[in-house]
């Protein structure tokens, strides 16, 4: 028998230094988890103690904090090969500052092999890639050698800007193939690593012949086998176990995100290449792990440009950004609309013909906008601003859910008025009417949407039966705000960009914002 | 500039042992993997052998298994081949090249001049 | 285990003229584990493509490469005194197998 480790990290977003329990900015540090010099503590404790080991990452480095706005993937390729990672599946937000922001920083920088089997590059594009990214690649390790083969999720076009000479085939269709390939070349063990959710995980674990262990990204699952560390809920064992179509048991495997955990999965092979078992569990990377003084050093050497940049100038305001609480919780607020105007302008994605977009809607808790801008400092907006108005460093998720769904979460939005209670939605593409009179559950009179199949956008009435996209707050999409029906009635949800980074995107495009109150929340009395 | 200096080549009789050497300059040397290939007199290019960063993963070609052991030393920036049971059909120039990863391989970026290895009795 | 063919063994022409040199797998490989290397006289080979497409840094643009599945080839689009020298196509999968070259020489 052969015994390989595998170690693994998925959905990292920039979370390059250490952060609080749930993600976000490090504030005791005595306290905080995760971050790449912790990462490299325990990396090399294992890599010192065991054999064979490999260093993992199924995708969606990319985007999250400060450290992508500024670095734009350089930091991305410099900490993965510091830390000696071996592998690399390429996730949607890969993508985000389109084909070339993934291949002049990260592509061409990153000493390690960039994996996917199901995006296939055409035109001009075909020729400038082409080796830069790989379906597979074969690791020695030992004297053993082992076949990663990679996948990202063929949604990416609606998720981020690859551009039009890329083509994302289904993830199953385009393993097969390479998996075989790998059989042909005597490669008898092999890993799925990639960017598609546990759904897609166990599907190709159940239907691509030749895969042993998939190592997955996207979904943000958190498995985990006994009592669980922190705060996450486990979706079920480390490893998931899922019968294939020919018998076998194949783990599959996703460690959470933003570095919290790192997945350590240990695999006993047979000399044929089979999986005669499989256990292990999720790390958590807190401070009983100190973090490594070099890659410390050099976080705090990169750090110093982060520190100029939220001081500049991003673009201009003329007009006062009403973020108060006595606005955003109440009425319609011009921060709310500027916010939400940037969410849907981030997701302009000219997939289809039929659409002039793919999503035409948003919805924003009020209680997420923490701070107005004052536009009386000669207009200047900055980062720092931006980071009081959205200090919880969340992201601006794409979401589907029926008609039905969003009525309830207009209700919910209204269903305590008066309160100064953060659920009061502010919103774009959508006109609401209330009816304050009328008893909580039945307050929403009017309820019009954007439509997108259609060549000049005008507002329908919202269909029940219908389903939509919309643009949200990861931290509804949570459930977050009483949103419950989201959470649970949501047929769909992809992760997207770090909220701060929407908004700065947007106004350092625009350069000068004047940002209205127009109409797109109204209340009425009696008889409508 | 990358720099790759073999060294260690000599005549030797059928059945005895070599050590060539490689010294690498001009780049972090345990960032990369690295190989050796050689080329027989008037012939094409064969892959003898490559070792990752850390010497993690190793890898031969089906000719030279068992017989010759690869080696590094990142302290020292060296490169080494230990070539056991030699044989006439072993005789060959030897160059040391370096990978474009670390911790598998693709392709070679960067080559030495190379060391010639004669094996005749 | 893959075997490369190179054809033709060698290829007399001037400078100025186009050279097309062709790389052939026993069976299909992916384009992404294809490099091409040029080998001048007394000297160590050289990267010139990898990925079966993509230029290596410092290589001039009238060297191309193309081809997927059994088929590659290298084209020099107008020969210069100095690309007379033997290409060799290389491919990777868990080990390295190289072409026996084709040797560009002046007609």
């Known amino acids: 028998a052969w015994e390989l480790t595998i170690l693994h990290t998925n959905d990292v977003h920039s979370r390059l230094e250490q952060t609080s329990e749930d993600s976000s900015k490090c504030v005791n540090a005595s306290r905080c988890m995760g971050g790449v010099a912790r990462l490299f503590t325990k990396v090399q404790q294992i890599r010192r103690a065991e054999p064979n080991v490999l260093l993992l990452d199924a995708g969606d480095q990319y985007q999250g904090t400060i450290w992508f706005t500024v670095y734009k993937g350089a930091e991305v390729a410099h900490f993965m090969n510091a830390l000696r990672y071996d592998a690399m599946a390429l996730g949607n937000h890969e993508f985000d500052n389109g084909v070339e922001g993934l291949i002049e920083p990260l592509l061409k920088e990153a000493k390690f092999p960039i994996l996917s089997a199901n995006i296939k590059a055409k035109g001009p594009l075909a020729s400038q890639i082409s080796g830069l990214y790989l379906p597979y690649k074969v690791l020695p390790v030992g004297d053993e050698v082992v076949g990663i083969v990679g996948y990202t999720s063929k949604e990416t076009p609606f998720l981020s800007n690859p551009g039009t000479n890329l083509v994302f085939e289904d993830e199953i269709t385009a393993l097969q193939p390479e998996v075989d390939k790998l059989k042909t070349l005597n490669v008898n063990k092999i890993i799925a690593l990639g960017h598609s959710g546990f759904e897609m995980d166990k599907l190709i674990a159940q239907k691509v012949r030749g895969v042993d262990v998939v190592v997955g990204g996207h979904s943000n699952t958190f498995l985990y086998t006994g009592n669980p560390p922190s705060k996450e809920v486990p979706a079920g064992k480390y490893p998931f176990i899922v019968t294939s179509d020919d018998g076998r048991k194949v783990p599959v495997v996703q460690a959470y995100a933003f570095g919290k955990y790192l997945g350590y999965l240990k695999i006993e092979f047979d000399e044929r290449g089979n999986v005669i078992s499989s256990h292990g569990n999720p790390i958590l990377l807190n401070s009983s792990i100190p973090e490594d003084p070099s890659i410390k050093a050099d976080i705090n050497k990169w750090r110093i440009k982060l520190d100029n940049y939220s001081t500049q100038e991003l673009g201009k305001t003329i007009v006062y950004l009403d973020g108060s609480s006595q606005s955003c919780r109440f009425r319609e607020c011009n921060m709310g609309n500027l916010i939400c105007d940037a969410m849907i302008n981030n997701n302009l994605r000219h997939t289809d013909e039929m659409f002039w977009n793919h999503v035409s809607m948003c919805i924003l808790n009020g209680g997420g906008i923490r701070s107005p801008i004052d536009e009386r400092n000669n207009g200047t907006i900055t980062w720092e601003n931006l980071a009081a108005v959205l200090p919880f460093g969340g992201t601006f998720d794409l979401v589907q859910l029926k008609g039905s769904t969003l009525k309830k979460a207009f209700e919910h939005s209204v269903h305590r008025y008066g309160q100064s209670t953060g659920e009061f939605l502010q919103v774009g593409g959508i006109h609401v009417v209330y009816d304050l009179s009328r008893k909580p559950g039945d307050r929403v009179v009017k309820l019009d949407v954007l439509c997108t199949k259609c060549r000049v956008p005008s507002y329908d009435p919202l269909k029940m039966d219908e389903v939509y996209k919309v643009i949200l707050p990861n931290f509804l999409a949570n459930g977050g705000d009483g949103f419950q029906m989201i959470k649970d009635e949501l047929l769909r949800h992809d992760s997207g960009d770090q909220d701060i980074n929407v908004v700065s995107t947007y106004i350092s495009k625009m350069k000068v914002i004047y940002p209205a109150v127009e109409g797109r929340i109204k209340f009425s009395t009696g008889s409508h | 500039e990358v720099q790759l200096v073999e060294s260690g080549g000599a005549l030797v009789q059928p059945g005895r042992s070599l050590r060539l050497s490689c010294a690498a300059s001009?780049?972090?040397?345990?960032?990369?993997?690295m190989h050796w290939v050689r080329q027989a007199p008037g012939k094409g290019l064969e892959w003898v052998s490559g070792?990752?960063?850390?010497?993690?993963?190793?890898g031969y070609a089906d000719s030279v298994k068992g017989r010759f052991t690869i080696s590094r030393d990142n302290a020292k920036n060296s490169l080494y081949l230990q070539m056991n049971s030699l044989r006439a059909e072993d005789t060959a120039l030897y160059y040391c090249?370096?990978?474009?990863?670390?911790?598998?391989?693709?392709?070679?970026?960067?080559w030495g001049q190379g060391i010639l290895v004669t094996v005749s009795s | 285990e893959i075997v490369l063919t190179q054809s033709p063994g060698t290829l007399s022409l001037s400078p100025g003229e186009r050279a097309t040199l062709s790389c052939r797998a026993s069976?299909?490989?992916?384009?992404?584990?294809l490099a091409w290397y040029q080998q001048k006289p007394g000297q160590a080979p050289r990267l010139l493509i990898y990925?079966?497409?993509s230029r290596a840094t410092g290589i001039p643009d009238r060297f191309s490469g193309s081809g997927s599945g059994t088929d590659f080839t290298l084209t020099i689009s107008r020969l210069e005194p100095e690309d007379f020298a033997v290409y060799y196509c290389?491919?990777?999968?868990?080990?390295?197998?190289f072409g026996p070259g084709t040797k560009v020489d002046i007609k």
């Open positions: 090249a370096k990978d474009r990863y670390y911790s598998s391989w693709l392709l070679f970026d960067n």
């Open positions: 001009g780049f972090t040397f345990d960032d990369y993997a």
């Open positions: 070792i990752t960063w850390n010497s993690g993963g190793i």
């Open positions: 069976q299909s490989v992916s384009s992404s584990y």
């Open positions: 990925g079966a497409s």
């Open positions: 290389q491919h990777y999968g868990s080990s390295f197998t």
